[in-house]
């Protein structure tokens, strides 16, 4: 297993609709054809997997149908979007990149993007 540098923004504020996007960029030492991207969330010292996708270079990322993540790739950059976020989802979102094929296997883990989320103000009750 060889190490690889992964860069991501330090802080992002999600939109009022609970959507946060950020780029995860990796310094690929070679010509990988199969890449796996995993988003991990760290909060209160606990790390949980948010979503993961494996893609062939030049193809779209495919997350599971029920995933809260979507993404696109361009060269050594992956543009990740996480949807359906609420204030309680505020935390450090870490991008993990694995170059699966061809060998050798490379692993890179970013420092994390602190995503802040604020729940939208409830609409005032209207009289009908």
């Amino acid at each position: 297993c060889k190490a690889m540098h992964v860069a991501q923004p330090a802080v992002v504020l999600a939109s009022s609709r609970g959507i946060a996007s950020f780029v995860c960029e990796y310094a690929s030492p070679g010509k990988a054809t199969e890449v796996r991207v995993t988003v991990l969330r760290q909060a209160d010292s606990q790390v949980t997997e948010v979503c993961a996708a494996t893609y062939m270079m030049g193809n779209e990322l495919t997350f599971l149908d029920d995933s809260i993540c979507t993404g696109t790739s361009s060269g050594n950059q992956v543009n990740l979007t996480i949807q359906g976020l609420r204030a309680m989802d505020t935390g450090l979102y870490i991008c993990k990149v694995e170059l699966m094929y061809p060998p050798p296997y490379y692993l890179g883990i970013g420092n994390g993007t602190q995503i802040y989320v604020i729940d939208p103000e409830p609409c005032p009750d209207s009289d009908f």
């Epitope: 923004p9 330090a10 802080v11 992002v12 504020l13 999600a14 939109s15 009022s16 996007s21 950020f22 909060a43 209160d44 204030a87 505020t90 450090l92 602190q114 802040y116 989320v117 604020i118």
Partner: antibody
Framework: QVQLVQSGAEVKKPGASVKVSCKAS????????IGWVRQAPGQGLEWMGW????????NYAQKLQGRVTMTTDTSTSTAYMELRSLRSDDTAVYYC??????????WGQGTTVTVSS | EIVMTQSPATLSLSPGERATLSCRAS???????LSWYQQKPGQAPRLLIY???TRATGIPARFSGSGSGTDFTLTISSLQPEDFAVYYC?????????FGPGTKVDIK
């Protein structure tokens, strides 16, 4: 080195607007946020809100909602805070600070805004 | 919003003494998002401690932070003349971020 440099002192009349700038250097501007904090004479620190330089999204303190606008110009690594309909109790030193998630680690030198008729 | 309170409002001590400053949050705050700042007259605040217990770059070892949940403490083990200032705690766990009212450490 990492630093934030703010615009100079301003004297404004009640009802006017003020726009304070905060120029960042020494780091990747879009990787962080810029927060704004003010301090009235002899008082403590008051959080005004912040802007994510990465995507331009903002979050403002409730009491300033509708009067404050925070923006960034990523081409010049500069953040701006505009406060409208100024009142005498807006007289304060206004600070910008880098938001990184876990502390405001770099602060501007402060901009004194005086509201007086 | 999370309301931060600090005690005491003023702490009068002599150089060389130990200072213990308290900060309480109105609801639980992850320790990763609790910071302490020092402010001297006419100067901008300076980050001392982040993550409740990690000293910021260049901060002397006499400053230490501890605590979790709703109760946090800043300790200055042996006060130096340059340590007499106002100290603020702040949370950036929930939006909006909020500061405590400050504790003034002055010379007895």
């Amino acid at each position: 080195q990492v630093q934030l440099v703010q615009s100079g002192a301003e004297v404004k009349k009640p009802g006017a607007s003020v726009k304070v700038s905060c120029k960042a250097s020494g780091y990747t501007f879009t990787s962080y946020g810029i927060g704004w904090v003010r301090q009235a004479p002899g008082q403590g620190l008051e959080w005004m809100g912040w802007i994510s330089a990465y995507n331009g999204n903002t979050n403002y303190a409730q009491k300033l909602q509708g009067r404050v606008t925070m923006t960034t110009d990523t081409s010049t690594s500069t953040a701006y805070m505009e406060l409208r309909s100024l009142r005498s109790d807006d007289t304060a030193v206004y600070y910008c600070a880098r938001v990184r998630g876990g502390g405001l680690d770099v602060w501007g030198q402060g901009t004194t805004v005086t509201v007086s008729s | 919003e999370i309301v931060m309170t600090q005690s005491p409002a003023t702490l009068s001590l002599s150089p060389g003494e130990r200072a213990t400053l308290s900060c309480r949050a109105s609801q639980s705050v992850s320790s990763s998002y609790l910071s302490w700042y020092q402010q001297k007259p006419g100067q901008a605040p300076r980050l001392l401690i982040y993550g409740a217990s990690t000293r910021a770059t260049g901060i002397p070892a006499r400053f230490s932070g501890s605590g979790s949940g709703t109760d946090f403490t800043l300790t200055i083990s042996s006060l130096q003349p340059e340590d007499f200032a106002v100290y603020y705690c702040q949370q950036d766990y929930n939006l909006p971020f909020t500061f405590g009212p400050g504790t003034k450490v002055d010379i007895k």
